[in-house]
């Protein structure tokens, strides 16, 4: 697995560092998950040639994975800092139960699929420090994911597989996006 | 072979607008970060703007900000920079770019560039 | 707009020397810089890229340090062929680079 952020050879060589600031953390932490979701998207398109198909729009049908528009806030043409972080800090608490999802897809990356997943988590509490307004950030319900997880999980092979290759794509744009927007907090 | 092809330069009066295209092939713009830099004769490089493929979110400098749009057609896998009330200080040769995608943070693929050059 | 601030604008140096250029950023931009290289006539070639990474294929003489504001290139023994201009470039927001070093034969 992966070595989470901060406790990379080169900080560990370089003690006399200083401290990473926390819109700094939040990067690192956000390139960190972005590295592992590359591993895991290469192990994806190396078992399936989902990465090259053009029918992803069958299995998106079943999905409903979270995407930024103009309307949250985050892009540079009506960016408004406190909407935004809202939306990503939902964003990515409606990920969670598609990255649980992932946990049992993957036989020589398990590791780095549960890395992504635990760094998930810590990023959102990072971002959760950083909201005024927790107040407007929406819980996904337990029952309806715990729901969503058995539909997905008994779908066939082929669309599992292409599941699995939306959900990795669709969660490395999403991060992309919120990394960009977060660097003009 | 992975290139970038950019045309519509030309000679425009200030206050005038211009229409700049940029064809890529080798690569899918509908999957990468595309940019444009200009260079004034003689001068330095300078940023304009920067399109992430994802949602077509658009970045520009303070400088242009207002007057250039730039776009993109998946389609025609061709990127455009509409550049409206053009100043004398747009003159430059504009280049169309690509950002590198994982994440190294650097310009890979550049173009030859096209002249623009605003004069009464 | 991030702005970077880069000096010298020009730098005599003969061959063998050991050259600097300075990169400094208005505001912290953690290891997101590169440095490019441009020759009369022709498209920017980068030498480094996350501050201190070497660009495949470029000469180990080259080198890159720095991180948050502060960055620099170091060229460690100037060779003909290095006598060009130079550039940073921040990525952290946008894409703004320095004015540029020119690099002249002394």
């Known amino acids: 697995a992966p070595v989470p952020p901060g406790e990379d050879s080169k900080d560990v060589a370089a003690p006399h560092r200083q401290p990473l600031t926390s819109s700094e953390r939040i990067d690192k932490q956000i390139r960190y998950i972005l590295d592992g979701i590359s591993a895991l998207r290469k192990e994806t398109c190396n078992k399936s040639n989902m990465c090259e198909s053009s029918k992803e729009a069958l299995a998106e049908n079943n999905l409903n994975l979270p995407k930024m528009a103009e309307k949250d806030g985050c892009f540079q043409s009506g960016f408004n800092e406190e909407t935004c972080l809202v939306k990503i800090i939902t964003g990515l608490l409606e990920f969670e139960v598609y990255l649980e999802y992932l946990q049992n897809r993957f036989e020589s990356s398990e590791e780095q699929a549960r890395a992504v997943q635990m760094s998930t988590k810590v990023l959102i509490q990072f971002l959760q420090k950083k909201a005024k307004n927790l107040d407007a950030i929406t819980t996904p319900d337990p029952t309806t994911n715990a729901s969503l997880l058995t539909k997905l999980q008994a779908q066939n092979q082929w669309l599992q597989d292409m599941t699995t290759h939306l959900i990795l794509r669709s969660f490395k744009e999403f991060l992309q996006s919120s990394l960009r927007a977060l660097r003009q907090m | 072979e992975v290139q970038l092809v950019e045309s519509g330069g030309g000679l425009v009066q200030p206050g005038g607008s211009l229409r700049l295209s940029c064809a890529a092939s080798g690569f899918t713009i509908s999957s990468n970060y595309m940019i444009w830099v200009r260079q004034a004769p003689g001068k330095g490089l300078e940023w304009v703007s920067d399109l992430y493929y994802y949602a077509g979110d658009t970045y520009y400098a303070d400088s242009v900000k207002g007057r250039f749009t730039m776009s993109r057609d998946i389609s025609k896998n061709t990127v455009y920079l509409q550049m409206n009330s053009l100043r004398a200080e747009d003159t430059a040769v504009y280049y169309c770019?690509?950002?590198?995608?994982?994440?190294?943070?650097?310009?890979?693929?550049w173009g030859r560039g096209t002249l623009v050059t605003v004069s009464s | 707009d991030i702005q970077m601030t880069q000096s010298p604008s020009t730098l005599s140096a003969s061959v063998g020397d050991r050259v600097t250029i300075t990169c400094r950023a208005s505001?912290?931009?953690?290891?997101?810089l590169a440095w490019y290289q441009q020759k009369p006539g022709k498209a920017p070639k980068v030498l480094i890229y996350?501050?201190?990474t070497l660009e495949s294929g470029v000469p180990s003489r080259f080198s890159g340090s720095g991180s948050g504001t502060e960055f620099t290139l170091t060229i460690s023994s100037l060779q003909p062929d290095d006598f060009a201009t130079y550039y940073c470039?921040?990525?952290?927001?946008?894409?703004?680079f320095g004015q540029g070093t020119k690099l002249e034969i002394k």
């Open positions: 505001q912290g931009i953690s290891s997101w």
């Open positions: 996350k501050a201190s």
């Open positions: 470039q921040q990525s952290w927001l946008g894409g703004s």
């Open positions: 770019a690509r950002w590198e995608e994982e994440g190294r943070g650097y310009i890979d693929v």
